[in-house]
């Protein structure tokens, strides 16, 4: 297993609709034809997998059916979008990239993106 540098933004603020997007960029030492991207969430020293996708030559990442993630790829950049976020989901979201093929296998883990989620204020009651 060889190490690889992965860069991602330090901070992202989710939209009022609970959507956060960020770019995960990896320094590929060669031309990988099969890449696996995993988003991990670290909160209170616990790490959980948010979503993962293996992609090849296309520009759209395909996630499992119940995933809250969507994404596209362009060169060595992966544009990730996480949906359905609420205030309790605030935390550090880490991008992990694996170059699955061809050998050798490379692994890179970013420093994480702190995603802040603020639940929208409920609309005040109307007289109408």
């Amino acid at each position: 297993c060889k190490a690889m540098h992965v860069a991602q933004p330090a901070v992202v603020l989710a939209s009022s609709r609970g959507i956060a997007s960020f770019v995960c960029e990896y320094a590929s030492p060669g031309k990988a034809t099969e890449v696996r991207v995993t988003v991990l969430r670290q909160a209170d020293s616990q790490v959980t997998e948010v979503c993962a996708a293996t992609y090849m030559m296309g520009n759209e990442l395909t996630f499992l059916d119940d995933s809250i993630c969507t994404g596209t790829s362009s060169g060595n950049q992966v544009n990730l979008t996480i949906q359905g976020l609420r205030a309790m989901d605030t935390g550090l979201y880490i991008c992990k990239v694996e170059l699955m093929y061809p050998p050798p296998y490379y692994l890179g883990i970013g420093n994480g993106t702190q995603i802040y989620v603020i639940d929208p204020e409920p609309c005040p009651d109307s007289d109408f």
Epitope: E34, Y55, M57, E60, T62, L64, T70, M100
Partner: antibody
Framework: QVQLVQSGAEVKKPGASVKVSCKAS?????SYWINWVKQAPGQGLEW???????????YYNEMFTGRVTMTRDTSTSTAYMELSSLRSEDTAVYYC????????WDQGTMVTVSS | DIQLTQSPSFLSASVGDRVTITCSAS?????IHWYQQKPGKAPKLLIY???TLASGVPPRFSGSGSGPEFSLTISSLQPEDFATYYC?????????FGGGTKLEIK
């Protein structure tokens, strides 16, 4: 030029298994997914699953999980789809298609399940 | 699973007509891809990533849309366009196809 060539038609009894091959040429086999698609007579298209020929990573449609196995042989640039416990509803044309965009298809393999 | 609903299921039209087929997803998807299939033949990629024409596809075909609603338009039908058309999504597994739209000569 890019070509996918599948094995010939098969007639099987209920409960049996069938293994269909898909030989690729004209491109780097390990750079594109190989997808398998089912089309029953007079019906639409149903994605069965896919395999990444390099690592062998597979994704299956849950409708077929437990009955379908996708493998590959990189030395011959051939992908295989094996379907077990065959029943009459499995009578269909099975296609292999290349990549994320399903940009190249073979003409398909007719599998008939009949007692 | 993401369901793709195509409408209409059947469409009768004449050579020279402009026709539009719609594809509605049960959940928002990033892109839609379109295929054409003629009887006894394998499907053929027409449009990928919602609006990009596949190699060799004539410009009378166009695709558009976003989120859950997408469409395929043929600006001026030619005799060779009478076929069945399928939309497909690959935002999430399992990849799914629409039920198809059979385009027939009026």
């Amino acid at each position: 030029q890019v070509q996918l060539v599948q094995s010939g038609a098969e007639v099987k009894k209920p409960g049996a298994s069938v293994k269909v091959s898909c030989k690729a040429s004209g491109y780097t086999f390990t750079s594109y997914w190989i997808n398998w698609v089912k089309q029953a007579p007079g019906q639409g298209l149903e994605w069965m699953g896919r395999i990444a020929p390099g690592s062998g990573t597979t994704y299956y449609n849950e409708m077929f999980t437990g009955r379908v196995t996708m493998t590959r042989d990189t030395s011959t640039s051939t992908a295989y789809m094996e379907l077990s416990s065959l029943r009459s509803e499995d009578t269909a044309v099975y296609y292999c298609a290349r990549g994320d965009y399903f940009d190249y298809w073979d003409q398909g393999t007719m599998v008939t399940v009949s007692s | 699973d993401i369901q793709l609903t195509q409408s209409p299921s059947f469409l009768s039209a004449s050579v020279g007509d402009r026709v539009t087929i719609t594809c509605s997803a049960s959940k928002s998807v990033s892109y839609i891809h379109w295929y054409q299939q003629k009887p006894g033949k394998a499907p053929k990629l027409l449009i990928y990533d919602t609006s990009t024409l596949a190699s060799g596809v004539p410009p009378r075909f166009s695709g558009s849309g976003s989120g859950p609603e997408f469409s395929l338009t043929i600006s001026s039908l030619q005799p060779e366009d009478f076929a069945t058309y399928y939309c497909q999504q690959r935002t999430t597994y399992p990849l799914t196809f629409g039920g198809g739209t059979k385009l027939e000569i009026k």
